[in-house]
C-alpha cells in the first residue's frame, strides 16, 4: 500500500559537510513502528546511505558507524547526514515503511538534492 512522503527539493550542506532535512509521511493508519531509509541516487545508481527502525515514543537510533542521525516527532523525521564531501552531492531519497501494526505501508519521497561544496583551503599567510 502506497503512502505519501514529503521532503525538501534542495538542501545546501554546511561548510563542515553537514546537511539536515525533514522527511514527513502521511500515515494512513496508526503507525507504531517505522523504518526510515535514506537512499542516494547518482548517475542512475541507487545506494543505501543509512536506515533506522524506531518505535513511536522511542528515539531514532542508527548504527554506531552511521553517517546519519535523526529525531522523530509525530509523522516527521528530522534527518542529519554528516561527513559529506563535494563528491557526495546527489539526490537523497527518503523511504518510509510502516512496519507495525499491519498492514504494511511503503512511501518513497521525490528526493532532496543535497549540494556539498568543499571549503576552500585557507591561503598561506606570509
Amino acid at each position: 500500500k502506497a503512502m505519501h512522503v514529503a521532503q525538501p527539493a534542495v538542501v545546501l550542506a554546511s561548510s563542515r559537510g553537514i546537511a539536515s532535512f525533514v522527511c514527513e509521511y502521511a500515515s494512513p493508519g496508526k503507525a507504531t513502528e517505522v523504518r526510515v531509509t535514506v537512499l542516494r541516487q547518482a548517475d542512475s545508481q541507487v545506494t543505501e546511505v543509512c536506515a533506522a527502525t524506531y518505535m513511536m515514543g522511542n528515539e531514532l537510533t542508527f548504527l554506531d558507524d552511521s553517517i546519519c542521525t535523526g529525531t522523530s516527532s509525530g509523522n516527521q523525521v528530522n534527518l542529519t547526514i554528516q561527513g559529506l564531501r563535494a563528491m557526495d552531492t546527489g539526490l537523497y531519497i527518503c523511504k518510509v515503511e510502516l512496519m507495525y501494526p499491519p498492514p504494511y505501508y511503503l512511501g518513497i519521497g521525490n528526493g532532496t538534492q543535497i549540494y556539498v561544496i568543499d571549503p576552500e583551503p585557507c591561503p598561506d599567510s606570509d
Partner: antibody, heavy 120, light 112 residues
Amino acid sequence: QVQLVQSGAEVKKPGASVKISCKASGYKFTDHFINWVKQAPGQGLEWIGDINPNNGGTNSNQKFEGRATLTVDTSISTAYMELSRLRSDDTAVYYCARLRREYFYAMDYWGQGTLVTVSS
Amino acid sequence: DIVMTQSPLSLPVTPGEPASISCRSSKSLLHSNGITYLYWYLQKPGQSPQLLIYQMSNLASGVPDRFSGSGSGTDFTLKISRVEAEDVGVYYCAQNLELPLTFGGGTKVEIK
C-alpha cells in the same frame, strides 16, 4: 534470558473486573511490543490486542474493544491487561507475548498464562 | 477479519514418519513487498505456545530443521520430515497481514 512472568489464577464473579500482570526480564522492556492472547478451555488462540511500552499506544481486537484495557509500567517492566464486565465466556487462559521485529512481528516469547475463571 | 482454516483437526503420527499440516487463509497473505505474513506456532501439552516458523518458511531460533514451511498466497503447509515424540501438541497457523491478528483452529498431533 528473556522471561515473561504472569500473575496467578483468578476467580471472579460475572460483572466484575480482573487485572492481570506480565513482568518482563532479560531484555529492554521498551524495545518490544507486548501482545495479549486469549485461550478458552479446549479452544484455540484469539488475539486481544497489543501495547507499545514507550508511549502506551494500543491496537485492539474490536471484539474486546471497550472491555480490555492494556497498560504498562515501564519502571517495573510490567504490562497489564484489565478485563471489565466479565462474562462466563471470558473464562480462559490469558497469555502475554513479546513481538520480535527480526521475526516480522511474530510472538517469540510467551508468558506462562493466567487462568481467569468467571463463575457466580 | 482474515479467517484461517486448518486441516486435519487431529493427526495421529508414527515416530520417524513424516507429517504434514495444512492451513488456508481467506485472503492472500503475500504482500506486494514480497513478504508472506504467515506464522506457525506449537503448543505442547500443558505449555504456552512457541514460535516455530515466521514469514511462511523461516525457522525461528532453536527450532529443529526437521520442521519446514511452504505455501502460496492462501495455501500453506507445515511439514515434519521425521516426527519425534516431543513434537506432539497443537499446531496453529496465524497471520499478521492485517489487524486483528488471527489464528487457525489448530491441529492436534498425537502419537499413534
